[in-house]
């Protein structure tokens, strides 16, 4: 018969003949003969493989470098990588997260909008009209004025997106 | 089909290094593992270790680990085991085989050590 | 790692069929399914008849079987011939790029 020159998913053409390919977590030792099978043995302590492959190495486990402020999120197997995430207070610089920085903290005037997580980062909103907020922080939101009216107090300083209202008692005197 | 030609027997004296020679032919000679393993006389097998042509990586057994350097010349496909420090016990017939499955072997090589 | 662990010896009469274990641990025959089986005629080279712990490669007689239970391997020669008395030698897969032999048996035709 003629010899292939193409080979069916998961298989791979070498020496006119047509081999599996190795499924993951193994990696290629032999191609396969007219006798004999495509030989693949298992990846490992710390590789993975995460294809059908003819590689002849695995992959090192990705390491979660504790100085870059990284953690384990998921311990590799022999058909996966290991996935690090950040310490907390810490988030991933990139979607690869190779290393980690501190949480952005919200100004005076802004509120946290979205609390950080391993992967993003503080989202920070100006506090509106009736909300304000007077601290640095990755997790305050902007708090609403106090409500003289309903404590039977008057409003004697305005609130900004900064301060809260100052609240006082009412003036009796009545001309 | 792969073939693998080995070199012819040696006589080395102890304390002195041989070394042993592989030549394969047939199939891509980068993409199949070379084991070694030795036969004393009237004994069993032995597996040493292997080398992974296309990269030239190794992996020895511990027995042998420090002793045994396995090589490869990808422009002639010919891999090489040399064996240091003999001793009268090494006395054997060393073979190369394919793979760790070992599917295909060399003729083999009497390697004699004696004084 | 230490060799795995065969009989010396085994033997049946033609057309019998024999078996020969091969006992190792859940490091090596336990924790793999590549064991593989030689067969090797006095001044011979040794050669495959069994791997991945049941395959046969092409050409070798459905004579020869194999199987897996827990730590032991085991190769069965049934129809016993004549030229099936030989040594045979298993050899496992043992991690980190490790492989171990048996001692090998002497199977005698009687």
């Known amino acids: 018969p003629e010899p292939p020159t193409a080979c069916r998913e998961k298989q791979y053409l070498i020496n006119s003949q047509c081999c599996s390919l190795c499924q993951p977590g193994q990696k290629l030792v032999s191609d396969c003969t007219e006798f004999t099978e495509t030989e693949c043995l298992p990846c490992g302590e710390s590789e993975f493989l995460d294809t059908w492959n003819r590689e002849t190495h695995c992959h090192q486990h990705k390491y979660c470098d504790p100085n870059l402020g990284l953690r384990v999120q998921q311990k590799g197997t022999s058909e996966t990588d290991t996935i690090c995430t950040c310490e907390e207070g810490w988030h991933c610089t990139s979607e690869a997260c190779e290393s980690c920085v501190l949480h952005r903290s919200c100004s005076p005037g802004f509120g946290v909008k979205q609390i950080a997580t391993g992967v993003s980062d503080t989202i920070c909103e100006p506090c509106p009209v009736g909300f304000f907020s007077n601290v640095s922080s990755a997790f305050e939101k902007c708090h609403p004025w106090t409500s003289c009216e309903t404590k039977d107090l008057v409003v004697q300083q305005a609130g900004t997106n900064k301060t809260d209202v100052v609240c006082g008692p009412q003036d009796r005197l009545r001309a | 089909q792969v073939q693998l030609v080995q070199s012819g027997a040696e006589v080395k004296k102890p304390g002195s290094s041989v070394k042993v020679s592989c030549k394969a032919s047939g199939g891509t000679f980068s993409s199949y593992a070379i084991s070694w393993v030795r036969q004393a006389p009237g004994q069993g097998l032995e597996w040493m270790g292997m080398i992974n042509p296309s990269g030239g990586t190794t992996s020895y057994a511990q027995k042998f680990q420090g002793r045994v350097t396995m090589t490869r010349d990808t422009s002639t496909s010919t891999v090489y085991m040399e064996l240091s420090s003999l001793r009268p016990e090494d006395t054997a017939v060393y073979y190369c085989?394919?793979?760790?499955?070992?599917?295909?072997w060399g003729q083999g090589t009497l390697v004699t050590v004696s004084s | 790692q230490s060799a795995l662990t065969q009989p010396p010896s085994a033997s049946g009469s033609p057309g019998q069929s024999v078996t020969i274990s091969c006992t190792g641990t859940s490091s090596d025959v336990g924790a793999y399914n590549f064991v593989s089986w030689y067969q090797q005629h006095p001044g011979n080279a040794p050669k495959l008849i069994i791997y991945d712990t049941r395959k046969r490669p092409s050409g070798i007689p459905d004579r020869f079987s194999a199987s897996k239970s827990g730590n032991t391997a085991s190769l069965t020669v049934s129809g016993l011939q004549a030229d099936d008395e030989a040594d045979y030698y298993c050899s496992s897969y043992a991690g980190n790029n490790n492989l171990v032999f048996g001692g090998g048996t002497k199977l005698t035709v009687l």
């Open positions: 085989a394919r793979g760790f499955r070992m599917d295909q």
